[in-house]
Amino acid sequence: SGTTNTVAAYNLTWKSTNFKTILEWEPKPVNQVYTVQISTKSGDWKSKCFYTTDTECDLTDEIVKDVKQTYLARVFSYPAGNVESTGSAGEPLYENSPEFTPYLETNLGQPTIQSFEQVGTKVNVTVEDERTLVRKNGTFLTLRQVFGKDLIYTLYYWKSSSSGKKTAKTNTNEFLIDVDKGENYCFSVQAVIPSRTVNRKSTDSPVECMGQEKGEFRE
């Protein structure tokens, strides 16, 4: 069944980073429009991106209501015009998305080194705690506030003059590492959720090196 002259959406794919979540699909519409619905397993369907000619729909506002829920979306195809003028055959075509659990599946965005401070042979490296679109009591939560101790950061650091990397880990957003006095070091960090089975790691942050703007040095 389905409405004549429409084709069902396919390749429904969730694209999500730090909970910014977009559903994408194909094909580009020809003489049809789309409407997306999203629901939790126990909830009602809610329509989004009504009669859109886009092939993506931002569902962030819905999934941030409870990032630990599992969501399902479906994409309806409607003829590009009222049904009586285009011909109708009952229920519209639709295609279901894969299930999506934001807390377990959203990609971790590329982290940023906020600052580093050297005091003698110690360096304190701070990772920026990025704000997400998840809200609690009207305020946006940071990545750390959402994930708590499930989120760790791995620091890669090395002397500017060599390629041998060392690593350190933290379940806060700060590292305190030992360095050789008089040596310049470079740093990169990666966000990791060890308990995950998919999307466990972010890409590495941009490299920051001592002797550049972000650093502060004290004897």
Partner: antibody
Framework: QVQLVESGGGVVQPGRSLRLSCAAS????????MHWVRQAPGKGLEWVAV????????YYADSVEGRFTISRDNSKNTLYLQMNSLRAEDTAVYYC????????????WGQGTLVTVSS | DIVMTQSPDSLAVSLGERATINCKSS????????????LAWYQQKPGQPPKLLIY???TRESGVPDRFSGSGSGTDFTLTISSLQAEDVAVYYC?????????FGGGTKVEIK
């Protein structure tokens, strides 16, 4: 000929509920998307809600989301608007309107029903 | 949301003269795939519901006199009444149907000078 006749308007206190109906005739109701549009006294037009021809998909203006529910009974050729938690700013003439050549182009409108929210 | 801005708010024109109403959208309502502008114009007389005049920015609804014409593309649109008649006294609204929520302009009141 196409006819849309709204009913159910009246005076209601803030916080109370009201259900509007729109009886359709003269066309194949089940084949058309339907909308509610309102007009506050002396003001312009404001789109309120839409429901697809099949009744599956519904969409609302932010100003009424969570308070109003649009529905339809294709066997009775009737469109509904359930209005809960009414506010003074919901005072308006409520029109039902039919999708025309394209979604959101209204080729037929009802005469409207006045809803007054006042204590 | 797409914001629709009409100008002027009111317009007084002599019978038989031309009336021009402008409508500006905060973002383009042109869909490049079919090169159509998702814009409509309505006429509302006192105590009556609106009546569809123009859709796709320039297509006249059947039964609408040819003195009414629509033009424009993208974000800037115009409704023209080439020779104002007494029965044209009304408020005119533009509306975008490009994306939801659907939005209307604030209206332009046309009167006889």
């Amino acid at each position: 000929q196409v006819q849309l006749v709204e009913s159910g308007g009246g005076v209601v206190q803030p916080g109370r509920s009201l259900r509007l109906s729109c009886a359709a005739s003269g066309f194949t109701f089940r084949s058309y998307g339907m909308h509610w549009v309102r007009q506050a006294p002396g003001k312009g037009l404001e789109w309120v809600a839409v429901i697809t021809y099949d009744g599956i998909n519904k969409y609302y203006a932010d100003s009424v989301e969570g308070r109003f529910t649009i529905s339809r009974d294709n066997s009775k050729n009737t469109l509904y608007l359930q209005m809960n938690s009414l506010r003074a700013e919901d005072t308006a003439v409520y029109y039902c309107a039919r999708d025309g050549v394209y979604y959101g182009v209204y080729d037929y409108w009802g005469q409207g029903t006045l809803v007054t929210v006042s204590s | 949301d797409i914001v629709m801005t009409q100008s002027p708010d009111s317009l007084a024109v002599s019978l038989g003269e031309r009336a021009t109403i402008n409508c500006k959208s905060s973002q383009s309502v042109l869909f490049s795939s079919n090169n159509k502008n998702y814009l409509a114009w309505y006429q509302q007389k006192p105590g009556q519901p609106p009546k569809l005049l123009i859709y796709w920015a320039s297509t006249r609804e059947s039964g609408v006199p040819d003195r009414f014409s629509g033009s424009g593309s993208g974000t800037d649109f115009t409704l023209t009444i080439s020779s104002l008649q007494a029965e044209d006294v009304a408020v005119y609204y533009c509306q975008q149907f490009h994306s939801y929520p659907l939005t209307f302009g604030g209206g332009t009141k046309v009167e006889i000078k």
